[in-house]
C-alpha cells in the first residue's frame, strides 16, 4: 500500500540503486517515486554529516522484501517511495533559500526576482534547475543574476550552503511552461543528433513517453521491428542538441522520430503504457513466474507486484494447466526490456502501477457513442451539474472536474449567488431525475471568480469552485485535462459541447445530459459574426454556419471538450452567444488555454 511516513534519525542499510543530491527529504522521496527501481530512500541533510561530499545526499534503494534494516543516524531522514499512492506529482514549486544547487551553468542573465528566474528556467528547453543571487548578495556583479543549469540526471551535481542565494527547479512538470508541444510522430525519419541514452521499446509511442520523462531527452528516434539492421530493431534513441531542435533529419524507411512532450506532460500519459504487444517477448530479469488465465490477468499480477515493471504472457498449450498460461513478471535497471523478440507467441506489456504517476485526466474513458444527442453514463465523466438550493433546488450551471477538489465553470453563473453554502455539486450524473434528497453531493468551500470579470461578453468568464471534500475518481467521475500552454497552435477537430441546458431558446432544463459535436470557428470569422462585440484571444468560438447545434441556457459553465491524441482536453467553458443555435451566430466560450496560469495559481496555492 501507500506508505507516507518518514523516519527521523534513521538510515536504511544496503540496497542502493542510485544516489544523487537533493535539497531536502521530500524532493529525495519524489526522485525515489519516479525512479524505476526505488522502493526506499535515505536522505542526509547538511546538519547530519560533516563529510561535505555526503551532505544533501539522497540514496535510492531497492529491496526484494520491500524493506531494509534501519540504523540510527542522527539527522538522517528515510522513507518509502510513493509509487503505490494516488495523485503523485513531479511538480515541485519550492524555493530553497541559501542553497546553491550546482550543475552546468549554461546561461546567466539579470532577473528582477527568483520567480522571474524560475519562469525563465521553466521556459528554457535545457533548464533543469536554477540559482538566483538576491540583491543582498555580497558580490555586486552577481546580484540579481539568474543562472540556468542542467545536468545529465536532472539533479544537482552538488549542493552547498551559500548565503543570499535561492535555488529551485524548472516548473515544466507543473504544466507551467510556454514551450511548444510538438506531438507529431514523423514516419520514415531519423534525427541525426547526439544520443544521450538508448532503451528498448515496443513502439514509437512508448519511446516518446520514455523520452518525455528522461531529464536530458529533447527528441528521439525509434527503429521499428522492420528496421533492416537486426541489432537495432526496437531501439529507442534518446537525443539532445545545443539548439534544442534536431540539426539534421534523414529520410529512412522503418524509422520514426518525435519530440519530448515535457512541457505538456500533464495532459498525456508519460509513465502509463497500457497497450498489449502480441507475438512479442520482453526480456529482463525474472521476478516470478505465475499461472494466469489471460494476458489481462498477467498485467494485473504485474501491476500488483510492486517490483514488476513489465511482463510476458505465454498462452497455454491446449488443455495444459487448466487453460492457464505462464505469466513472467520482469524488471530491469531502467524499467524497459533489455531485449524485445518477435515471433515466439508471447504477449507482453507493462505494469499499470505507473499510471498513478500520470495525471488522472489522461486515463482512457469509454468509447464515445456515435450519433444521437443524449449521452450515456460515463461518457463525459468530468461533467458536473451545479445546483443552487435557494429559493428552491434547481440546476444552475454545468462545470468540469479538473482536480480532486476543483470544478472549473463560468463566472456569470454566480450572479446573485451570495454564499457558497447554497451550492451543491453533483458528479457522475446522467439524468437530473436521479438527484433526490439523499443523493450525495459536494459542498462548495469557496467560489473563486476571476478578478477581471465584469460580464460574460467582455471576457474573463471563468470561475473555480473549491469543494469541501475531495472527489474519489471512478469511471463515472474523473477529471478532464487542461490544455497545455504549448498547445496554443493545435487545431482541434473533435470537439463536443455537453450540458442539461435548453434545446431551444424558450425551453426547460433537459433531464438527460445532451451532447453535440461542434466545429471550432476562427476568431476572425467569429468577430465578423459579432460586430458589436470584441472577440478577444481569451475567447474561442464554435458552431455550424447554418446553426442548428449549440450550447444554450443552462449549459453555461459546462465544458467544450476536444479530443486530441486520444486525450480529452477542456478547450472552452460555455460562456455566451446571440440566441441559441442561430445561423451564423457561433457560441462563444472562455478560451481555457489562456487561463492555465490563473487556474494553476489558484489551485496550487499553498
Amino acid at each position: 500500500g501507500c506508505l507516507t511516513q518518514l523516519y527521523e534519525n534513521a538510515f536504511f542499510r544496503g540496497g542502493d540503486v542510485a544516489s544523487m543530491y537533493t535539497p531536502n527529504a521530500q524532493y529525495c522521496q519524489m526522485r525515489c517515486t519516479f525512479h524505476p527501481r526505488c522502493l526506499l530512500f535515505s536522505f542526509l541533510p547538511a546538519s547530519s554529516i560533516n563529510d561535505m561530499e555526503k551532505r544533501f545526499g539522497c540514496f535510492l534503494k531497492d529491496s526484494v522484501t520491500g524493506t531494509l534494516p534501519k540504523v540510527h543516524r542522527t539527522g538522517a531522514v528515510s522513507g518509502h517511495s510513493l509509487k503505490q499512492c494516488h495523485q503523485i506529482s513531479a511538480c515541485n514549486k519550492d524555493i530553497y533559500v541559501d542553497l546553491d544547487m550546482k550543475g552546468i551553468n549554461y546561461n546567466s542573465s539579470v532577473a528582477k526576482s527568483a520567480q522571474e528566474c524560475q519562469e525563465r528556467c521553466t521556459d528554457d528547453v535545457h533548464c533543469h534547475f536554477f540559482t538566483y543571487a538576491t540583491r543582498q548578495f555580497p558580490s555586486l556583479e552577481h546580484r540579481n543574476i539568474c543562472l540556468l543549469k542542467h545536468t545529465q540526471t536532472g539533479t544537482p551535481t552538488r549542493i552547498t550552503k551559500l548565503d543570499k542565494v535561492v535555488s529551485g527547479f524548472s516548473l515544466k512538470s507543473c504544466a507551467l511552461s510556454n514551450l511548444a508541444c510538438i506531438r507529431d510522430i514523423f514516419p520514415n525519419t531519423v534525427f541525426a543528433d547526439s544520443n544521450i541514452d538508448s532503451v528498448m521499446a515496443p513502439d514509437a509511442f512508448v519511446c516518446g513517453r520514455i523520452c518525455t520523462h528522461h531529464p536530458g531527452c529533447l527528441f528521439f528516434t525509434f527503429f521499428s521491428q522492420e528496421w533492416p539492421k537486426e541489432s537495432q530493431r526496437n531501439l529507442c534513441l534518446l537525443k539532445t542538441s545545443e539548439s534544442g531542435l534536431p540539426s539534421t533529419r534523414i529520410k529512412k524507411s522503418k524509422a520514426l522520430s518525435g519530440f519530448s512532450l515535457q512541457s505538456c506532460r500533464h495532459s498525456i500519459p508519460v509513465f502509463c503504457h497500457s497497450s498489449f504487444y502480441h507475438d512479442t517477448d520482453f526480456l529482463g530479469e525474472e521476478l516470478d513466474i505465475v499461472a494466469a488465465k489471460s494476458h489481462e490477468a498477467c498485467q494485473k499480477l504485474c501491476t500488483n507486484a510492486v517490483r514488476c515493471q513489465f511482463f510476458t504472457y505465454t498462452p497455454a498449450q491446449a488443455s495444459c494447466n487448466e487453460g492457464k498460461g505462464k505469466c513472467y513478471l520482469k524488471l530491469s535497471s531502467n524499467g524497459s526490456p533489455t531485449k524485445i523478440l518477435h515471433g515466439r507467441g508471447g504477449i507482453s506489456g507493462y505494469t499499470l502501477r505507473l499510471c498513478k504517476m500520470d495525471n488522472e485526466c489522461t486515463t482512457k474513458i469509454k468509447p464515445r457513442i456515435v450519433g444521437g444527442t443524449a449521452s450515456v453514463r460515463g461518457e463525459w465523466p468530468w461533467q458536473v451539474t451545479l445546483h443552487t438550493t435557494s429559493p428552491t433546488q434547481r440546476h444552475l450551471c454545468g462545470g468540469s472536474i479538473i482536480g480532486n477538489q476543483w470544478i472549473l465553470t463560468a463566472a456569470h453563473c454566480f450572479y446573485g449567488v451570495e454564499s457558497p453554502k447554497i451550492l451543491r455539486v453533483y458528479s457522475g450524473i446522467l439524468n437530473q431525475s436521479e438527484i433526490k434528497e439523499d443523493t450525495s453531493f459536494f459542498g462548495v468551500q469557496e467560489i473563486i471568480i476571476h478578478d477581471q470579470y465584469k460580464m460574460a461578453e467582455s471576457g474573463y468568464d471563468i470561475a473555480l469552485l473549491k469543494l469541501e471534500t475531495t472527489v474519489n475518481y471512478t469511471d463515472s467521475q474523473r477529471p478532464i485535462c487542461l490544455p497545455s500552454k504549448g498547445d496554443r497552435n493545435v487545431i482541434y477537430t473533435d470537439c463536443w459541447v455537453t450540458g442539461w441546458g435548453y434545446r431551444k431558446l424558450r425551453d426547460k432544463i433537459q433531464n438527460t445530459l445532451q451532447k453535440a459535436k461542434i466545429p471550432l470557428v476562427t476568431n476572425e470569422e467569429c468577430q465578423k459574426r459579432y460586430r458589436g462585440h470584441k472577440i478577444t484571444h481569451k475567447m474561442i468560438c464554435a458552431g455550424y454556419r447554418e446553426g442548428g447545434k449549440d450550447a444554450c441556457k443552462g449549459d453555461s459553465g459546462g465544458p467544450l471538450s476536444c479530443k486530441h491524441n486520444e486525450v480529452w482536453h477542456l478547450v472552452g467553458i460555455t460562456s455566451w452567444g446571440e440566441g441559441c443555435a442561430q445561423r451564423e451566430r457561433p457560441g462563444v466560450y472562455t478560451n481555457v488555454v489562456e487561463y492555465v496560469d490563473w487556474i494553476l495559481e489558484k489551485t496550487q496555492a499553498v
Epitope: K102, N105, S108, V110, P138, S139, L140, E141, H142, L147
Partner: antibody, heavy 121, light 108 residues
C-alpha cells in the same frame, strides 16, 4: 573571437588628464559587465572600476581613484572608456580593460593587451 | 574589503615537478575564487574559476581546490610554458574585486 584593444595611454604630467579607450569585438558588448584593471611596473594587479551592463547608473570605483576617474561605455560603438583626471605618479601603470563573465562566479575571462600610462613631470 | 594573501611570493621548480600555490582570504568567500596566469609583457589569462573549474582551453594539469578561506592551485607536472606569475582573485564580496599579491614561478 573575443578581442579587446586598449588605446590612449602615454606620458602625462601630474594633475593632468587622459582618456583611455577599449574597443571590443567578437561578443555582444552591451550584455557584459566591463572592468578596468591596472598593474604598476613590477607590481601586482589592482582593480580600478566596473561598468555594469544592466544598469546605466551602476559604476563602481576603487577607493584609490574615486572622484578622479570616470568609467563610461558606448554600446552603439562597442567602446569602453576611462576618463582619468588629476593624475598622480602612483597612477603610473599598464591599464587593462577586461570583460566579465559569470562562469558560476564572476570572472575576468578576457583581457586586452594593455596600454601604458606614465605620470611624470 | 576582503584581503587575499598568496604564498609563497615566489618559488623555483623544475620541469615535471608538482607545484602547489596557496591563497587565503581574510573571510569566507565560499567558492568565489579565480586563478589567473600572467606571463611577462602579457595580459593575465583566466585558468580556474569558482575555485575548481577549469577554464576551457586550459590544460588539465592545472587544478584548483578549496572553499571558504583556504584555496590551492596545483600544477601536476610543470611544463616549460608554465613559468609565469599566478594571481588569485575573489569575486564574492565586491566591489572591490581583490587580487592576491601574486606568486612568481621560476625555473630552478
Amino acid at each position: 573571437q573575443v578581442q579587446l584593444v586598449e588605446s590612449g595611454g602615454g606620458v602625462v604630467q601630474p594633475g593632468r588628464s587622459l582618456r583611455l579607450s577599449c574597443a571590443a569585438s567578437g561578443f555582444t558588448f552591451s550584455s557584459y559587465n566591463m572592468h578596468w584593471v591596472r598593474q604598476a611596473p613590477g607590481k601586482g594587479l589592482e582593480w580600478v572600476a566596473i561598468f555594469l551592463s544592466y544598469d546605466g547608473s551602476n559604476k563602481y570605483y576603487a577607493d584609490s581613484v574615486k572622484g578622479r576617474f570616470t568609467i563610461s561605455r558606448d554600446n552603439s560603438r562597442d567602446m569602453l572608456y576611462l576618463q582619468m583626471n588629476s593624475l598622480r605618479a602612483e597612477d603610473t601603470a599598464v591599464y587593462y580593460c577586461a570583460k566579465s563573465e559569470i562562469l558560476v562566479v564572476p570572472t575576468l575571462d578576457y583581457w586586452g593587451q594593455g596600454t601604458l600610462v606614465t605620470v611624470s613631470s | 574589503d576582503i584581503q587575499m594573501t598568496q604564498s609563497p611570493s615566489s618559488l623555483s621548480a623544475s620541469v615535471g615537478d608538482r607545484v602547489t600555490i596557496t591563497c587565503r582570504a581574510s573571510q569566507s568567500i565560499s567558492s568565489y575564487l579565480n586563478w589567473y596566469q600572467q606571463k611577462p609583457g602579457k595580459a593575465p589569462k583566466l585558468l580556474i574559476y569558482a575555485a575548481s573549474s577549469l577554464q576551457s582551453g586550459v590544460p588539465s594539469r592545472f587544478s584548483g581546490s578549496g572553499s571558504g578561506t583556504d584555496f590551492t592551485l596545483t600544477i601536476s607536472s610543470l611544463q616549460p610554458e608554465d613559468f609565469a606569475t599566478y594571481y588569485c582573485q575573489q569575486s564574492y564580496s565586491t566591489p572591490p574585486i581583490t587580487f592576491g599579491q601574486g606568486t612568481r614561478l621560476e625555473i630552478k
